[in-house]
């Protein structure tokens, strides 16, 4: 059996339903059997566990995804395999084996695999702050959200108005979330905002940042 | 060699039922998906059922779905077609074909000619 | 349902002319296509599976392409025994379709 599946990697939002298609041909024979089995991000392929069985007729969802998963077509026995999986939550990201068996059909091993990735959108990132912030000193601002997909981006904004800083003070990383301020002044001194951004939407923390000069204690 | 030999073809009435066999020799008849194909005079070929194997999944198109009903004798190497609710439409030689490995249509009968008309 | 489109629907030749016959799928079948010849009074014969594949027995003047949506049967060298009705029919998913049909006559 020659299974096709998409070649691109398919996304899904969080929360809505997934249709991983999944298409083959052959003469279905009473011997016809169709399984999907899920890999977890990172792991071989051996290592995968079924979620949905069709064989003799009848359809056996598996495992901790069984209340979700379900067929486009029931039976599975046009030449359509399309698994839907309902309300989609981050630990369903992964890789999604699709394997048909027609005997006598054994002109190709009859699998196909479609990687998964459930679209989240960047939850409220943590601000903090760790270096010297006297007059002189360098600070680094860090930004971070625990939950993502793809990962966020971080952007690093100074709220109100101040003197442009020269060049070079100020470095950001977008992909770290860091942002790393030198050479700081009491101008420096402000808040500080954090954007984590990615194609499902955004979030932001603050961070006040205050300047001493040397002889004073670190207030942040 | 392969033979389909397909019968009980003929005229009925819009709304009248017909049974259609094919009786199957030279070949493993039970390891085989079977399909009925039609062809109305003067035009194309339409496939309209087929049956796989042991006779556990059938397959119509939605022009034939609910109206005709395909099955299977292995023990008799023999296919049929049962056609209720006959149309004008349904008017075509019937042809009982063998399916390959892949759902093409490897060995056909001769046919048999189904007439619906009052 | 994918719908079989065959051109030409008529085409006139000679024996010892090359033949090309045209399908095309509504969407893409990859390779799941299947030629047939018919003559007159008499049951299909199948001519060409999976695009390209001859069965035992087919004369090797015929020939198949094509993948996705595009298809061709070609005659290299049309024989007094060619002159009949062709057609295309795709073997993907259900349900399974045919073009209308070419048919090849005599010039």
């Known amino acids: 059996v020659e299974v096709k599946v998409p070649t691109e990697p398919l996304s899904t939002p969080l929360g809505k339903t997934a249709e991983l298609t999944c298409t083959y041909s052959t003469s279905v024979g009473d011997s016809f059997a169709l399984e999907w089995s899920f890999v977890q991000p990172g792991k071989p392929i051996s290592e995968s566990h079924p979620i949905l069985y069709f064989t003799n007729g009848h359809l056996y969802p598996t495992g901790s995804k069984s209340k979700r998963v379900s067929l486009l077509q029931n039976p599975p026995t046009v030449g359509v395999a399309t698994l839907k999986l309902t309300d989609v939550h981050p630990s369903d990201t992964g890789t999604y084996l699709c394997q048909v068996n027609n005997p006598p059909d054994f002109y190709t091993n009859g699998l196909g695999l479609i990687n998964l990735t459930v679209l989240v959108p960047p939850s409220n990132p943590l601000c903090s702050q760790s270096g010297q912030t006297s007059v002189g000193g360098s600070t680094a601002l860090r930004c971070s959200s625990s939950e993502g997909a793809p990962k966020p981006v971080y952007n690093w904004v100074r709220l109100g108005t101040f003197p442009t800083p020269s060049p070079g003070s100020m470095v950001q990383d977008e992909v770290s979330g860091q942002l790393i301020l030198t050479n700081l002044s009491l101008t420096s001194s402000g808040t500080y905002r954090c954007v984590a951004t990615n194609q499902m939407g955004s979030a932001s923390c603050e961070l006040t940042l205050s300047v001493t000069e040397p002889s004073q204690g670190r207030v942040a | 060699q392969v033979q389909l030999v397909e019968s009980g073809g003929g005229l009925v009435k819009p709304g009248g039922s017909l049974r259609l066999s094919c009786a199957a020799s030279?070949?493993?008849?039970?390891?085989?998906?079977m399909s009925w194909i039609r062809q109305a005079p003067g035009k194309g070929l339409e496939w309209v059922a087929s049956?796989?194997?042991?006779?556990?999944?059938?397959h119509y198109p939605d022009s034939v779905k609910g109206r005709f009903t395909i099955s299977r004798d292995n023990a008799k190497s023999s296919l049929y077609l049962q056609m209720n609710s006959l149309r004008a439409e349904d008017t075509a030689v019937y042809y009982c074909?063998?399916?390959?490995?892949?759902?093409?249509?490897?060995?056909w009968g001769q046919g048999t000619l189904v007439t619906v008309s009052s | 349902d994918i719908q079989m489109t065959q051109s030409p629907s008529t085409l006139s030749a000679s024996v010892g002319d090359r033949v090309t016959i045209t399908c095309r799928a509504s969407?893409?079948?990859?390779?799941?296509l299947a030629w047939y010849q018919q003559k007159p009074g008499k049951a299909p014969k199948l001519l060409i599976y999976?695009?390209?594949t001859l069965p035992e027995g087919v004369p090797s003047r015929f020939s198949g392409s094509g993948s996705g949506t595009e298809f061709t049967l070609t005659i290299s060298s049309l024989q007094p025994d060619d002159f009949a009705t062709y057609y295309c029919?795709?073997?993907?998913?259900?349900?399974?379709?045919f073009g209308q049909g070419t048919k090849v006559e005599i010039k």
């Open positions: 074909a063998r399916q390959g490995v892949r759902p093409f249509f490897d060995y």
């Open positions: 030279g070949f493993t008849f039970s390891n085989s998906g």
């Open positions: 049956i796989s194997d042991g006779g556990l999944y059938t």
């Open positions: 969407e893409n079948i990859y390779s799941y």
């Open positions: 999976n695009a390209e």
């Open positions: 029919q795709h073997h993907y998913v259900i349900p399974w379709t």
